[in-house]
Interface confidence: low
């Protein structure tokens, strides 16, 4: 008599998570009499997936009616597939007996489950860095299968090449994770820049998934300082300006010192943005020249974003300004008038 064949025609089947998987199996003969069972895996640790005679298998249904006479199709459908269902499934013929004896196994069908990667999450450096420094951004996405995946980095539309990417685990798994680090060299113009991490995978039917990070969270643009004297006013007051330009973020404290003594402290707030995302701030100090015997050393001291203070000094030459007759010559500071230019 012809030897019984158990035919599993597909070596592999790939299914999206949440879909149903059909695992085909036919036998070439009705004899000998005995049941068919489905297992995941081989050997002593194999897992029973479906047994027509007994057991409760709520997610598994036969494709054709196994009770009808002369049925030789023992294909099954597994519903609501998850990555945990991945593995090799064997259709096994038993000879009826007490107990039933395993007679022949099909070649097996490998079920791979396609699971979408999670939305990429991009994280930047913990502390800000200045222009010309390199900062690292990390992108992570999890829970995808199969392992093949493409990840690309872009900064303002340009693909980045200084990238290191790892997919874990290295061996077989029900799902995988990707972690990629991109190194970006900052420029002073990067306040409005953005990095994008783009993940493409077999499960994504349209555009890749994207995660973004703004370089504004990673960059510090230190200010330029300039102290200038305006022409002296008729009332013997000299207008001194401290221009603080092109800085980011806005967190900035400005202190005026007269001959080393604190005259006034101001905090920047609600400044308008420049086109490149940086800020400018101008502070004015009125110095009453007639209140001073000697030259006045004015210092504009700027503390930006918690960094060490930056100073710019300017000497107002008192000798160059003749004092008014009978004016009070005691060293008193009347320079309390100020204006902020926004």
């Amino acid at each position: 008599e012809e030897e019984l064949q158990v035919i599993q025609p597909e070596k592999s089947v790939s299914v999206a998570a949440g879909d149903s998987a059909t695992l085909n199996c036919t036998v070439s003969s009705l004899i000998p009499v005995g049941p068919i069972q489905w297992f995941r895996g081989a050997g002593p640790g194999r897992e029973l997936i479906y047994n027509l005679k007994e057991g409760h298998f709520p997610r598994v249904t036969p494709v054709s009616d196994p009770t009808k006479r002369n049925n030789m199709d023992f294909s099954i459908r597994i519903s609501n597939i998850t990555p945990a269902d991945a593995g090799t499934y064997y259709c096994v013929k038993f000879r009826k007996g007490s107990p039933d004896v395993e007679l022949k196994s099909g070649a097996g069908t490998e079920l791979s489950v396609r699971a979408k990667p999670s939305a990429p999450v991009v994280s930047g450096p913990a502390v800000r860095a200045t222009a010309e420094h390199t900062v690292s951004f990390t992108c992570e996405s999890h829970g995808f299968s199969p392992r093949d995946i493409t990840l690309k980095w872009f900064k303002n539309g340009n693909e980045l090449s200084d990238v290191q990417t790892n997919v874990d685990p290295a061996g077989k798994s029900v799902s995988y994770s990707i972690r990629s680090t991109a190194r970006v060299v900052l420029t002073r113009r990067d306040v409005h820049s953005q990095v994008i991490c783009e993940v493409a995978h077999v499960t994504l039917q349209g555009d890749p998934l994207r995660g973004t990070a703004n370089l504004s969270e990673a960059i510090r643009v230190p200010p330029f300082l300039e102290v200038t004297q305006q022409s002296m006013r008729a009332d013997n007051q000299v207008n001194v300006t401290c221009q603080v330009t092109k800085f980011y973020p806005q967190r900035l404290q400005l202190t005026w010192l007269e001959n080393g003594n604190v005259s006034r402290t101001e905090m920047a707030s609600a400044l308008p943005e420049n086109k490149d995302g940086t800020y400018n701030w101008t502070s004015w100090l009125l110095v009453n020249v007639s209140a001073h015997r000697d030259d006045v050393k004015l210092t504009c001291q700027v503390e930006h974003d918690g960094q060490p203070a930056v100073n710019k000094s300017f000497s107002v030459k008192v000798s160059a300004h003749p004092k008014e007759q009978g004016s009070n010559t005691a060293a008193e500071n009347t320079g309390t008038n100020e204006r902020n230019i926004y």
Epitope: D148, A200, V202, T203, L204, Q205, P208
Partner: antibody
Framework: QIQLVQSGPELRKPGETVKISCKAS????????MNWVKQAPGKVLKWMGF????????TYADDFKGRFAFSLETSASTAYLQINNLKNEDTATYFC????????????????WGQGTSLTVSS | DIVMTQSQKFMSTSIGDRVSVTCKAS??????LAWYQQKPGQSPKALIF???YRYIGVPDRFTGSGSGTDFTLTITNVQSEDLAEYFC?????????FGAGTKLELK
Amino acid sequence: QIQLVQSGPELRKPGETVKISCKASGYSFTNYAMNWVKQAPGKVLKWMGFINTYTGEPTYADDFKGRFAFSLETSASTAYLQINNLKNEDTATYFCTRTRGYYDFDGGAFDYWGQGTSLTVSS
Amino acid sequence: DIVMTQSQKFMSTSIGDRVSVTCKASQNVGTHLAWYQQKPGQSPKALIFSASYRYIGVPDRFTGSGSGTDFTLTITNVQSEDLAEYFCQQYNTYPLTFGAGTKLELK
């Protein structure tokens, strides 16, 4: 580096069959769809369709249904374009071109191209 | 089918100039638009995808812009190696379609 290398120029008579190959290297072949594009002399580039290298399923543009067949030899990272019952108007350069990493996505932008295979059909 | 119109078949330029190649889609394609450069006897070379993203290795003198139906490829400081034909292509809707091309030549 990533390369798509196509087979050499072909001269055929009307009614014959031709099979053009495109061998990919430098990347994971089954991660990117392979498209075919026709460039006839003096005519606009014409997208013929693509084959999903992950599933082997071909998709043809309407003008290329019937006499045209895309196939794969995955183990050799090679895609094929076969044209049956050749006509004079099949005279053109045929390019294979890879779709960016969109896998199952229908088409996309083409980041790498083969050097092209010139086909001349003449009696 | 979506028709991609490149109204200028030829454009004359000088080395160092700035030139803009335009492309119009017959219907909205979002930003699913790519630009290619082709030199005689060569295969097309990918320049831009998603309307404005440069491929790695493409000089930053090439800039893509636009969305919806109107797109522009701008080349600033044109170099001699930029003298070639430029094609746009939409990949929003099947069938994927190309523009007829714009040839950049010296004045």
